[in-house]
């Protein structure tokens, strides 16, 4: 029961986490910037992985996509890749974990198969969560290192004067969504791995010994029964009867839990 609960909870937590990773990847607010905040109008700029937006206090918002790939920093491309890998791994993990759920029966799937699938999905969730956390952390690092030292920098450009104004980029909501979502996916993956241990079928810790009566008269040797149980000195299950009684090792090469003494 506890295993089913752990597996189910792990699945739900991972599902929420992956939904969060998808949401964070699509969000525009990875970095935010206050451009003006005067009595006339307040203008904010926020940038995501795919486009940049300008929003005014009036409610007007204009977004433009990063149409060129070549002009974008390698770090942004790396963050995009990490987030996409995280989503893909998470989605595959979810698909695998659905079939691995103990509460869902599919044909005559054995517990060992379900255990393997649970472990696989758990590992996928862990890697997915780590990808998301890494991606968001790389972006956050970009923001921290991107603050310009100079307050204003004047230079002459094409068609007149150009002035650079220092505007600080701060952490956007998407970063926090990404961190939390990545963490949830990671926790969900760990829970799935824990559940996998409980799902794995226990192996028998005893050796069964079978006795086969023969047509000939069996000569009883004293101490034979004690030795044959496996608890005495005869632990190697050596042959102690002259007749038809044989050890399990000699009769069957693959003992199973369905053999009875």
């Amino acid at each position: 029961m506890a295993v089913t609960a752990c597996q189910g909870l792990g699945f739900v937590v991972s599902l929420i986490g992956i939904a969060g990773i998808i949401a964070a990847t699509c969000m525009d607010q990875w970095s935010t910037q206050d451009l003006y905040n005067n009595p006339v109008t307040a203008v904010f700029n926020y940038q995501g992985l795919w486009r940049s937006c300008v929003r005014e206090s009036s409610g007007f918002t204009e977004c433009r996509g990063y149409f060129t790939l070549l002009g974008l920093p390698a770090m942004l491309q790396a963050v995009r890749a990490l987030m996409i890998v995280g989503i893909v791994l998470g989605a595959i993990g979810l698909l695998v974990s659905i079939f691995a759920l103990k509460c869902i029966r599919i044909g005559s799937m054995e517990d060992s198969a379900k255990a393997n699938m649970t472990l696989t999905s758990g590992i996928m969730f862990i890697v997915s969560g780590l990808c998301a956390i890494a991606g968001v952390s790389v972006f956050a690092n970009m923001l921290v290192t991107n603050f310009w030292m100079s307050t204003a920098n004047m230079y002459t450009g094409m068609g007149g004067m150009v002035q650079t104004v220092q505007t600080r980029y701060t952490f956007g909501a998407a970063l926090f969504v990404g961190w939390v979502a990545g963490g949830l996916t990671l926790i969900g993956g760990v829970m799935m791995c824990i559940a996998c241990r409980g799902l794995a079928p226990e192996e028998t810790n005893y050796k069964a010994v079978s006795y086969h009566a023969s047509g000939h008269s069996v000569a009883y040797k004293p101490g034979g029964f004690k030795a044959s149980t496996g608890f005495g000195s005869n632990t190697k299950n050596k042959k102690i009867y002259d007749g038809g009684a044989r050890t399990e090792d000699e009769v069957q090469s693959y003992p199973s839990k369905h053999d009875y003494v």
Partner: nanobody
Framework: QVKLEESGGGLVQAGGSLRLSCAVS????????MGWYRQAPGKQRELVAT???????SYSDSVKGRFTISRDNAKSTVYLQMNSLKPEDTAVYYC???????????????WGQGTRVTVSS
């Protein structure tokens, strides 16, 4: 590289009208605000009018009711319709655009070369 190109300046009689236009070209992410400033001979550059992409406008007291700023977001162009011109409106009119050039780049204030407006009495 971003370029601002003004046009429409010239000589006009007092009480007359002129329409200035300024087009922004080049590679950039977002234009935040666009506006017009002017500099009369021997004076400081002063704000005439500005507009945001959303249509919020502001005017200097000296031109309120006479000048109208408008924009065409699709063409990244700003216009200044000047009516009831006075001799004191004589100046070089500069186009201004606050632009975000690229990803995580700082806001840059771009200025045009200026177009001369002369109002004769």
């Amino acid at each position: 590289q971003v370029k601002l190109e003004e046009s429409g300046g010239g000589l006009v009689q007092a009480g007359g009208s002129l329409r200035l236009s300024c087009a922004v070209s080049g590679n950039f992410l977002n234009i935040v605000t666009m506006g017009w400033y002017r500099q009369a001979p021997g004076k400081q550059r002063e704000l005439v009018a500005t507009t945001t992409r959303g249509g919020s406008t502001s005017y200097s007291d000296s031109v309120k009711g006479r000048f109208t700023i408008s924009r065409d977001n699709a063409k990244s162009t700003v216009y200044l319709q000047m009516n009831s011109l006075k001799p004191e409106d004589t100046a070089v009119y500069y186009c201004n655009a606050d632009i975000i050039p690229g990803f995580l780049q700082q806001l840059t204030v771009h200025w045009g070369q200026g177009t001369r407006v002369t109002v004769s009495s």
